[in-house]
């Protein structure tokens, strides 16, 4: 804080505000009868320079003029942009102990004249909004700079408003607080911005506009949709708009979509009919407005209207499959399965399925409704049966899908040939086959069916299947395919009244099994040893097991073990070997092999055959 200048004065030439790069002379003068009391000639005036309250320089060596004991003039140069404080102090040199006494001080501001403001842009939000203009001020001036926004228009009227920039606030936008009304639509307005500070002034180029150029309509509001006769595909979108709007843009999309449907509507007057909506679909609707067909700006998009279109009766055909199991000599269990319709086919919430099983000749019909995607019934083994399923929502039911119940694997001549399963990547398997060689009736379609080879999978899990046209001989299966799991894959060839099938195992990715089979027993029968084992637990198989290996060697031998390789069959859990010597103790163990390699060995068992073995 500078004390009130009791001892003297400080003046600046040419002025306390100077352009960057200019020099200034600072004069410090003592008032009469002020100074060092005993020895006026010992008065020494010193000038200190402060930036941000920090002393940065003693300008003792910059004196250009000195009236000893009365006044001194200092020249200051290379001042940086912004404000610098100079304090003049009196140093009574005969008294070393007393600090210099402040006389007076002055602030010098260094800056630049304002550049002409550029890029003026004005907007009025809505017919009842007010005009606000923004501009680019150019380089920072480092001085308080006043900006005047001036708008001239019809009726010889000019309005203006002011703001200023300094080191605390920036002025590059002003709201004039005035409204241009539609009756001025044809009028031209001129706006300019003038900048003034202590070092000069400058004016922007005039910027001309019309009402239509700057008025941005308010976005439409109160959006709603009315579905004609509860239709799921036709609706009238309605909204409120400002009175002068002549053009609207509508955009709408299903909520999970990534691209909008766009529609332009002229003179819509807050109403537009949409005819291509998808039933029972969550949609988002937005509207924008414009005041002129060719000129002017679009409003912001309105707030979204989110709504679901009404249901319509399902369309499309259910994909049905079935399984047959004989229960006894005159009864069989039929399990029907079907895939849910996709949303565009279901066109609503599926409430239930109508299932019909019909014996063609005797006209026996079993009917039921279910909410599930499977249905099981026990029926006689005799007769020709057909099944149909349709899906129902609140508006109606789909056309029933029919399938003939045939013995799926009953006709060897219809069995596809050379079925193979190759892993394509982590989550799919390519199945290929050749058509049946001597089919006596035409193949109508192929069904590729698969299920995980895990305990209980037949009862716990429905099958997965793909329908393949008769001229295709391959299928890429991916639904519910996981790596390191073995699947039983069946390819069915179906004619009108018969079926044939071939089976193969496949996996999408494999590793060597975690462990080998566990030998549970070794028994001797008729000069042969029977090795019994338990299969490797399902999670440890890590793919399809191709074969098992039984190893044996004499107990203390260092020779390579002998081995016997057995083709893997899920149903098999014992195997005979006959090349062991009697009364010799052997160590036996087993391993399992997948396409990726061999497992570690399972448990070791010792056995000494008793009888004659050759």
């Amino acid at each position: 804080n500078i004390d009130v200048c009791k001892l003297g004065t400080v003046t600046v030439q040419p002025a306390p505000v100077i352009p960057l790069g200019s020099a200034a002379n600072i004069s410090c003068s003592l008032n009469p009868k002020q100074g060092c009391s005993h020895y006026p000639s010992s008065n020494e005036l010193i000038l200190l320079k402060f930036v941000n309250d920090v002393l940065v320089e003693n300008l003792h060596g910059k004196k250009v003029h000195d009236h000893t004991g009365h006044s001194s003039t200092f020249q200051v140069t290379n001042l940086s942009l912004g404000m610098t404080l100079f304090v003049c102090k009196l140093n009574c040199s005969n008294s070393q102990k007393k600090p210099p006494v402040p006389v007076c001080g002055v602030e010098i501001s260094v800056g630049v004249a304002p550049e002409p403001p550029q890029n003026i842009s004005c907007v009025q939000e809505g017919e009842n909004g007010t005009v606000a203009c923004s501009w680019n001020s150019g380089k920072v001036t480092y001085l308080k700079t006043n900006y005047t926004l001036q708008l001239s228009g019809p009726n010889n009227l000019t309005c203006q408003k002011q703001c200023f920039s300094d080191n605390r606030q920036n002025c590059n936008r002003l709201d004039l607080g005035i409204n241009l009304s539609p009756d001025l639509a044809e009028s031209r307005f001129i706006v300019r911005v003038t900048a003034i500070n202590d070092l000069g002034n400058s004016s922007s180029l005039p910027h001309t506009f019309t009402f239509l150029d700057i008025v941005i309509p308010l976005p439409p509001w109160d959006i709603r949709i009315n579905f004609l006769n509860a239709s799921g595909s036709r609706g009238t979108l309605q909204w409120e708009d400002e009175g002068q709007v002549v053009l609207n843009q509508l955009r709408y999309q299903p909520l999970n979509s990534t691209s909008w449907n766009m529609v332009n509507a002229t003179n819509a007057k807050g109403k537009y009919d949409l005819r291509d909506l998808r039933p029972f679909t969550e949609y988002e609707f937005q509207i924008s407005s414009k005041l002129h067909l060719s000129g002017g700006s679009w409003s912001n998009w309105s707030e979204s209207l989110r709504t679901r279109t009404p249901e319509e009766e399902p369309v499309g055909i259910l994909d049905i499959w079935y399984m047959k199991q004989d229960i006894d000599y005159d009864r069989q269990q039929i399990s029907l399965f079907w895939k849910s319709l996709n949303p565009s086919e279901a066109r609503g919430k599926i409430l239930h399925y109508q299932v019909t099983l019909q014996e063609v000749t005797k006209k026996t019909t079993l009917q039921n409704t279910t909410r599930h995607t499977s249905w099981t019934r026990v029926i006689p083994r005799t007769g020709a049966w057909t099944a149909s399923v349709s899906a129902a929502n609140s508006k109606g039911a789909s056309a029933p899908t029919h399938i003939n119940i045939v013995d799926l694997c009953g006709t060897g001549l219809l069995a596809p040939h050379q079925v193979s399963a190759k892993s394509e990547n982590m989550d799919n398997i390519l199945v290929t086959w050749q058509p049946p060689k001597k089919a006596d009736s035409a193949v109508r379609e192929y069904i590729v069916e698969w299920r995980a080879l895990q305990p209980g999978s037949i009862t716990k899990f429905p099958p997965h299947w793909l329908r393949i046209p008769p001229d295709n001989m391959s299928a890429l299966i991916s639904e519910n395919i996981k790596p390191y799991i073995c699947y039983e894959i069946r390819v069915h060839a179906l004619s009108e009244s018969q079926g044939g099938c071939s089976s193969i195992r496949g996996d999408s990715k494999h590793k060597a099994p975690v462990s080998g089979p566990h030998i549970t027993a070794i028994t001797e029968k008729k000069e042969r040893l029977f090795i019994s084992w338990t299969h490797i637990p399902f999670p440890e198989q890590r793919g399809c097991i191709l074969h098992y290996r039984i190893y044996w060697k004499e107990r203390d031998s260092t020779a390579q073990p002998e081995l016997c390789e057995i083709q893997y069959r899920r149903s098999q859990n014992s195997h005979p070997i006959s090349s062991l010597q009697p009364r010799v103790t052997y160590v036996l163990w087993m391993t399992a092999v997948t396409a990726a390699g061999e497992s570690p060995q399972g448990n070791e068992r010792e056995f000494c055959p008793q009888g004659k073995a050759n």
Epitope: N155, L157, C159, K161, D175, I178, N179, S181, L184
Partner: nanobody, 129 residues
């Protein structure tokens, strides 16, 4: 009772300056629109300058006086001024102070006499050549 009282008029030589004052009493107009009109003999009363009354006060001027006239107000004192520089003989007229009881937002309404609810008696300005 609302009263607007103008003062500061007089006889001035061309090129001179005047500062007209309008003091309002009976009501606060600090946030509302105020304006100066003038009427020369045998002519209609015409708009000279105005203040919109909206936040920050936008000033309006007839193009004929733009740059020479400056309108301002002191809300605390309920007073409005018109600084007139470089007076011309055609500035000779009775100058009236007018006040509205609302903010004037519409560009088109600022210069209309019907926009303003209260008027002063006027102060004579005569410019001699």
């Amino acid at each position: 009772q609302v009263q607007l009282q103008e003062s500061g008029g007089g006889l001035v030589q061309a090129g001179g300056s005047l500062r007209l004052s309008c003091a309002a009493s009976g009501r606060t107009f600090s946030n509302y629109a105020m304006a100066w009109f003038r009427q020369a003999p045998g002519t209609e009363r015409e708009f000279v300058a105005g203040l919109s009354g909206s936040g920050g006060d936008t000033a309006f001027y007839d193009n004929s006086v733009m740059g020479r006239f400056t309108i301002s107000r002191d809300s605390a004192k309920n007073t409005m001024w018109l600084q007139i520089n470089n007076l011309k003989p055609e500035d000779t007229a009775v100058y009236y102070c007018a006040a509205a009881t609302h903010v004037v937002v519409s560009y088109g309404l600022v210069r209309r006499r019907g926009t303003y609810d209260y008027w002063g008696q006027g102060t004579q300005v005569t410019v001699s050549s």
